[in-house]
């Protein structure tokens, strides 16, 4: 779908405050197939050479209220023998996401968009760039 | 802030459609300090033992319109010699995020929330669980 032309009942895109008062349906549409969702393994956090743990971050004034955040278990990576490899670092992969925060002193269903940087998992990096041959 | 008691001007939380018509200010608040944002390295995708590429996913009817998605470069991981290690797999770390999608046939500033599964980066996993000793 492309943007439809502005009608008199729609806020004008040029209006200074149009972004400040959009209407949103917060009933989550599951656009993921249940197959895709169930195929997505949640055990990578243990099987990775840079394993991580997940901590629960809850804020009742945020949408989504609950976000699970990753933290790397070790500073180093785990080698094939299960030992820490001091030449390789375990680093957090972060992603910037948008969340909705309730506008303070307003109705419970009035929000503003806010950016949040969340840890998603860890990866193992060397201190120098290597390319597969 | 906590939820304020319902007043006559606020929709009732138990009303069947209360989640379907909330107001959102889309002017993004950057709650990340510029320090935190600038400290976030973007070179992990090359230095990782499970390197990845990023592709641009753009949808003008989505907010945010542009999302960068990761794809693993190899099926296997890259070892210390820069060779592919056939005992270790490079796997995509995915995160479920919420995006706003324009409601079809409605004003350009009326959205619904939709789930989206995005690749954030890759990690190297073994086929068996190993714990660092």
């Amino acid at each position: 779908a492309v943007l439809i032309p502005q009608s008199s009942v729609c806020p004008n895109a040029e209006a200074n405050n149009f972004l400040q008062n959009v209407k949103v349906n917060l009933k989550v549409i599951n656009s993921l197939s249940s197959k895709a969702s169930s195929r997505r393994p949640s055990d990578y956090l243990n099987r990775s050479t840079s394993p991580w743990t997940l901590s629960r971050n809850e804020d009742p004034d945020r949408y989504p209220s609950v976000i699970w955040e990753a933290q790397c278990r070790h500073q180093r990576c785990v080698n094939a023998e299960g030992k820490l490899d001091h030449h390789m670092n375990s680093v957090l992969i972060q992603q910037e996401i948008l969340v909705l925060k309730r506008e303070p002193e307003k109705c419970p269903f009035t929000f503003r968009v806010e950016k949040m940087l969340v840890g998603v998992g860890c990866t193992c990096v060397s201190s120098i760039v290597r390319h597969a041959s | 802030a906590v939820l304020i008691p319902q007043s006559s001007v606020c929709p009732n939380a138990e009303a069947n459609n209360f989640l379907q018509n909330v107001k959102v200010n889309l002017k993004v608040i950057n709650s990340l300090s510029s320090k935190a944002s600038s400290r976030r390295p973007s070179d992990y995708l090359n230095r990782s033992t499970s390197p990845w590429t990023l592709s641009r996913n753009e949808d003008p009817d989505r907010y945010p319109s542009v999302i960068w998605e990761a794809q693993c470069r190899h099926q296997r991981c890259v070892n210390a010699e820069g060779k592919l290690d056939h005992h270790m797999n490079s796997v995509l770390i995915q995160q479920e995020i919420l995006v706003l999608k324009r409601e079809p046939e409605k004003c350009p500033f009326t959205f619904r929330v939709e789930k989206m599964l995005v690749g954030v980066g890759c990690t190297c996993v073994s086929s068996i669980v190993r714990h660092a000793s």
């Epitope: 917060l26 209220s65 609950v66 | 906590v2 008691p5």
Partner: antibody
Framework: EVQLVQSGAEVKKPGSSVKVSCKAS????????IHWVRQAPGQGLEWIGV????????FYNQKFDGRATLTADKSTSTAYMELSSLRSEDTAVYYC??????????????WGQGTTVTVSS | EIVLTQSPDFQSVTPKEKVTITCSAS?????IYWFQQKPDQSPKRWIY???ELASGVPSRFSGSGSGTDYTLTINSLEAEDAATYYC?????????FGQGTKLEIK
């Protein structure tokens, strides 16, 4: 219709383990966390911990940390609670309950029917 | 941990009477939740986020409070309200419940 159906009653020996299942239906399994709560005979409610089927994340009441293991199988929409090193004080009804990840003020809205675990030598 | 203390532990009430159950928290919390439990049944969510009645809960029930002091009120008790009521907090780990208040109909 939302349902959380738990496995049947168990009788266990002290020192052994028990694994209780909770099969969810009537909603999107990964939109909700699964919390576990127990109730000893004639007593109040005690929170054990939470599992997030979406991410695999778990968080435990410290009292149960190390003894309780919460897991979930997304393919069958089933959550599990395993309790090890059982003692007589673990005799209780164990409940699973769901918790909406997106808008948490709803709290724990639907509960399983409960699974009675009896620990006796 | 936050301790929730309910008062009274037990109350025998005649139908149509007004009933007040209080829940006092050892530290300030943002919301209180109330559950109703009848013998040999699972708990049912009764009041959430302090004020909101769960679906199907009669309007004679109400919830109020803030900080450390919360109340569940039944305006005109009916026989079907005989049950044990638990308050619950999830503002701080571990999540905790009150010891319960058993309501009996005279």
């Amino acid at each position: 219709e939302v349902q959380l159906v738990q496995s049947g009653a168990e009788v266990k020996k002290p020192g052994s383990s028990v694994k209780v299942s909770c099969k969810a239906s009537g909603y999107t399994f990964t939109d909700y966390e699964i919390h576990w709560v127990r109730q000893a005979p004639g007593q109040g409610l005690e929170w054990i911990g939470v599992n997030d089927p979406e991410s695999g994340g778990t968080f435990y009441n410290q009292k149960f940390d190390g003894r309780a293991t919460l897991t979930a199988d997304k393919s069958t929409s089933t959550a599990y609670m395993e309790l090890s090193s059982l003692r007589s004080e673990d005799t209780a009804v164990y409940y699973c309950t769901r918790y909406y990840r997106y808008e948490s003020f709803y709290g724990m809205d639907y509960w399983g029917q409960g699974t009675t675990v009896t620990v006796s030598s | 941990e936050i301790v929730l203390t309910q008062s009274p532990d037990f109350q025998s009430v005649t139908p149509k009477e007004k009933v007040t159950i209080t829940c006092s928290a050892s530290s300030s919390i943002s919301y209180i939740y109330w559950f109703q439990q009848k013998p040999d049944q699972s708990p049912k969510r009764w009041i959430y986020a302090t004020f909101e009645l769960a679906s199907g809960v009669p309007s004679r029930f109400s919830g109020s409070g803030s900080g450390t002091d919360y109340t569940l009120t039944i305006n005109s008790l009916e026989a079907e309200d005989a049950a044990t009521y638990y308050c619950h907090q999830r503002s701080s780990y571990p999540w905790t419940f009150g010891q319960g208040t058993k309501l009996e109909i005279k």
